[in-house]
């Protein structure tokens, strides 16, 4: 025999107290799949969290962080303070990157500038605490009259690498 609860759609639960009929999820709860015997309590976005997507009868609320903070962890389980570009977050707050390191994001750590010579290239543009060094072509890549060429294997990410 088919389980009568399997007919209960998302947004409802199979109510054992009412002959296993499908009852709507109570306020502030949801069921994202059919055949559920209970509804889950909606996540509440409080304090440094703010609501990005309201809870519905079929899906949980989604949180992000208030301005000045960014999400960490699966499903934005934590909020961490932003820093300025060229800084990193320490136990004592945001601190400027040391010479020879950079951070082009509002989160993460300061990372050492790229060492162009490891790839046989020269420094095309010096680094700063906000930006990485740009490596130029190796001498063999330069053709007469060319002011520059894209490094055959240039840098890494969008303005930075992820943390």
């Amino acid at each position: 025999l088919q389980d009568p609860c399997s007919n209960c759609p998302a947004g409802t639960f199979c109510d054992n107290n009412r002959n296993q009929i499908c009852s709507p999820c109570p306020p502030n709860s949801f069921s994202s799949a059919g055949g559920q015997r209970t509804c889950d309590i909606c996540r509440q976005c409080k304090g440094v969290f703010r609501t990005r997507k309201e809870c519905s009868s079929t899906s949980n609320a989604e949180c992000d962080c208030t301005p000045g903070f960014h999400c960490l962890g699966a499903g934005c389980s934590m909020c961490e303070q932003d820093c300025k570009q060229g800084q990193e977050l320490t136990k004592k707050g945001c601190k400027d990157c040391c010479f020879g390191t950079f951070n082009d994001q509002k989160r993460g750590i300061c990372r050492p500038w790229t060492n162009c010579s490891l790839d046989g290239k020269s420094v095309l543009v010096n680094g700063t605490k906000e930006r990485d060094v740009v490596c130029g072509p190796s001498p063999a890549d330069l053709s007469p009259g060319a002011s520059s060429v894209t490094p055959p294997a240039p840098a890494r990410e969008p303005g930075h690498s992820p943390q």
Partner: antibody, heavy 127, light 110 residues
Framework: EVQLLESGGGLVQPGGSLRLSCAAS????????MSWVRQAPGKCLEWVSV????????YYADSVKGRFTISRDNSKNTLYLQMNSLRAEDTAVYYC????????????????????WGQGTLVTVSS | QSVLTQPPSASGTPGRRVTISCSGS????????VTWYQQLPGTAPKLLIY???HRPSGVPDRFSGSKSGTSASLAISGLRSEDEADYYC???????????FGCGTKLTVL
Amino acid sequence: EVQLLESGGGLVQPGGSLRLSCAASGFTFSGYDMSWVRQAPGKCLEWVSVIYPDDGNTYYADSVKGRFTISRDNSKNTLYLQMNSLRAEDTAVYYCAKHGGQKPTTKSSSAYGMDGWGQGTLVTVSS
Amino acid sequence: QSVLTQPPSASGTPGRRVTISCSGSSSNIGNNYVTWYQQLPGTAPKLLIYADSHRPSGVPDRFSGSKSGTSASLAISGLRSEDEADYYCATWDYSLSGYVFGCGTKLTVL
């Protein structure tokens, strides 16, 4: 020669889903950041998302955050974009783009721009 | 509305020089590298300038980029009919944690 070939575009109803793919060849796919960039008919270029090759870290434009998911399979040299809860304003040509700057040679690819582009695949969201 | 501001159009006659501006803020252009792209009608964009002012191999030296403060410029000298295209500036924006493009400048060669 860098080659990027997008596929998976088509007509979809509002609220629907679509998965785009980008097959890459001619370079070491696993060493480069990859982005999706879109362009609505007659409109500007709009960056959508980027994924890094090492840790798989991802970033998204606010307009698609929570609806789109970028991923990559380095063993298949393929980039993906899963698009859910599609809206009319998502109608655009979607380009797959390779960033300059091979990891681990350098740490930041932003300086080098997007030096390889596919020809794009059209996504139309309409009822 | 784009975070980077470009004039919607520019024009010039063959052989002349034209400049396209791109204005931003300290969270993007001010502290990050600017790149420029050329998009010919009906084609995908092509990288024209990287790291503010450097040309990839194969890009003619008629194209040059510069940056000052929170603004960048693309200059095209010795204008040719084949330069007729849309030109986009782009950079990383740390406050948005994403790349940003200008809305493009349509260059017409008269």
